[in-house]
C-alpha cells in the first residue's frame, strides 16, 4: 500500500519474456543482453552499448547493439547530433545546403545528398521560403532590377538605355528617343 | 518410452578435451531444455550445466564456465557437452537428463536420466 | 549460491519403519506461491531418479510410501514403511535459482 507495484510476472506482457529457461526483465536502452536471467522474473544481465553502437529501446534478445552510422561524406552530409549509447547518429546537411533525397517515396531513413542552396541575393531576387528541408524558393527581383527572360536585369543608371515596358514599370523609366 | 543413450567419456589427460553425447528418444526433444549432471567418484552430485528448449541459451556453474560448452542438435534429436582444459577434479561419472517444466512457475525438475558416463582426468 | 543441507548423511532403519530425511536451504527456495524443491533416489551403480517435486508432489509411477513437505527453507522427506529396495541414497535439490544445488546425500542402509 503506497508504494509502486513490480510488474507482474508474465512471459505474455511487456516486462517479461522468455528468454532462455525463465521469463527475464529486458534490458534498457542503451543495454545489450549479455546473459539471461537465471531464476524465474529475473533481471538479465545487461552491459552498457560500447562506444559508436546503440540499442534505441528496451530490449529482450539483443546480445549486441547496432553499430551508429557514419554520416556520408560523399554526400555532403553532417552529423547533427552524435550517436549515443540510445539513439544513432542523426545525419543532415550544415547550414545552407539541403535534404534532396535519391529516392521517390522519401522517408526520414531514405537515403539522400545535400545540395547547396539557391543564393537569392546572388540571382538578384527577393527569398520567399528559406531554405531547409528543400531549396530556397526565390520570388521577385530585387528594387533596383526588373524580370527579363530567366533573369533579373539592372535598372539603366541613366536614360540613355534602352528600357521595355517591364523595365519602366519597375525602374520608373519610358523608353527615351 | 524415453531414453537417454550416453557416449564419449573415457581416460583424458589433464589440459585435454573430450565430447559427450546423448542421444535422446521417446519424447520430443525439442520441446525440452536439457541438462547434464556429474557425479566424482563416492561423492554426491553436481549440476554441470543446462541447455534451454527454443533459443538454445546455456548455463553453467562458476567450476565449469568457459572451460565446458553444451550444444544440441534438435534435427538429430541429441546433447553434447564439450569439455575443454580438464583438471582432475573433473573426473566424474557424466549424466545427462531431461528438464521437465512444471506448470506456469517456470519451475524445472530433472525427471529423466541416461545411465552416465566416466570420464577420467589423469596423467 | 543457495546452500542445501541435509541430515543425517547417513541412517540405518528396519523394514516397516518410518525414515525421515530433513534438508534445509539456504534460503527461501518459494516462488509465486510453489517451493522449487525435489527429491531424488539414486540406487548404487545407477542414475538418480526423481520421486518428488515441488516440496510434495509424488511424481508419476512412484510408489505412496514416499512423500514430501515443508515450504520456505525447511524440508522434510518421508518413507512411510521402509521396504528392502528402498536401500539408496537421497539427494534434495533446489531449482529456485541457477546454479541448481543438491544436498550432499543420505544414505540409507537397512538395520
Known amino acids: 500500500q503506497g508504494g509502486t507495484r513490480s510488474p507482474r510476472c508474465d512471459c505474455a506482457g511487456d516486462f517479461h519474456k522468455k528468454i532462455g529457461l525463465f521469463c527475464c526483465r529486458g534490458c534498457p536502452a542503451g543495454h545489450y543482453l549479455k546473459a539471461p536471467c537465471t531464476e524465474p522474473c529475473g533481471n538479465s544481465t545487461c552491459l552498457v552499448c560500447p562506444q559508436d553502437t546503440f540499442l534505441a529501446w528496451e530490449n529482450h534478445h539483443n546480445s549486441e547493439c547496432a553499430r551508429c552510422q557514419a554520416c556520408d561524406e560523399q554526400a555532403s552530409q553532417v552529423a547533427l547530433e552524435n550517436c549515443s549509447a540510445v539513439a544513432d547518429t542523426r545525419c543532415g546537411c550544415k547550414p545552407g545546403w539541403f535534404v534532396e533525397c535519391q529516392v521517390s517515396q522519401c522517408v526520414s531513413s531514405s537515403p539522400f545528398y545535400c545540395q547547396p542552396c539557391l543564393d537569392c541575393g546572388a540571382l538578384h531576387r527577393h527569398t520567399r521560403l528559406l531554405c531547409s528541408r528543400r531549396d530556397t524558393d526565390c520570388g521577385t527581383c530585387l528594387p533596383g532590377f526588373y524580370e527579363h527572360g530567366d533573369g533579373c536585369v539592372s535598372c539603366p543608371t541613366s536614360t540613355l538605355g534602352s528600357c521595355p515596358e517591364r523595365c519602366a514599370a519597375v525602374c520608373g523609366w519610358r523608353q527615351m528617343f | 518410452q524415453v531414453q537417454l543413450q550416453q557416449s564419449g567419456g573415457g581416460l583424458v589427460q589433464p589440459g585435454g578435451s573430450l565430447r559427450l553425447s546423448c542421444a535422446a528418444s521417446g519424447f520430443t526433444f525439442s520441446s525440452y531444455a536439457m541438462s547434464w549432471v556429474r557425479q566424482a567418484p563416492g561423492k554426491g552430485l553436481e549440476w554441470v550445466a543446462t541447455i534451454s528448449d527454443g533459443d538454445s541459451y546455456s548455463y553453467f556453474p562458476d567450476s565449469v564456465k568457459d572451460r565446458f560448452t553444451i550444444s544440441r542438435d534438435n534435427a538429430r534429436n541429441s546433447l553434447y557437452l564439450q569439455m575443454n582444459s580438464l583438471r582432475a577434479e573433473d573426473t566424474a561419472v557424466y549424466y545427462c537428463?531431461?528438464?521437465?517444466?512444471?506448470?506456469?512457475?517456470?519451475?524445472?525438475?530433472?525427471?529423466?536420466w541416461g545411465r552416465g558416463t566416466l570420464v577420467t582426468v589423469s596423467s | 549460491d543457495i546452500q542445501m543441507t541435509q541430515s543425517p548423511s547417513s541412517l540405518s532403519a528396519s523394514v516397516g519403519d518410518r525414515v525421515t530425511i530433513t534438508c534445509r536451504a539456504s534460503e527461501s527456495v518459494e516462488f509465486s506461491g510453489t517451493s522449487l524443491m525435489q527429491w531424488y533416489q539414486q540406487k548404487p551403480g545407477k542414475a538418480p531418479k526423481l520421486l518428488i517435486y515441488a516440496a510434495s508432489n509424488v511424481e508419476s509411477g512412484v510408489p505412496s510410501r514416499f512423500s514430501g513437505s515443508g515450504s520456505g527453507t525447511d524440508f522434510t522427506f518421508t518413507i512411510s514403511s521402509l521396504q528392502p529396495e528402498d536401500i539408496a541414497t537421497y539427494y534434495c535439490q533446489q531449482s529456485r535459482k541457477l546454479p541448481y544445488t543438491f544436498g550432499q546425500g543420505t544414505k540409507l542402509e537397512i538395520k
Open positions: 537428463a531431461r528438464d521437465r517444466i512444471y506448470g506456469s512457475v517456470q519451475y524445472y525438475a530433472m525427471d529423466y
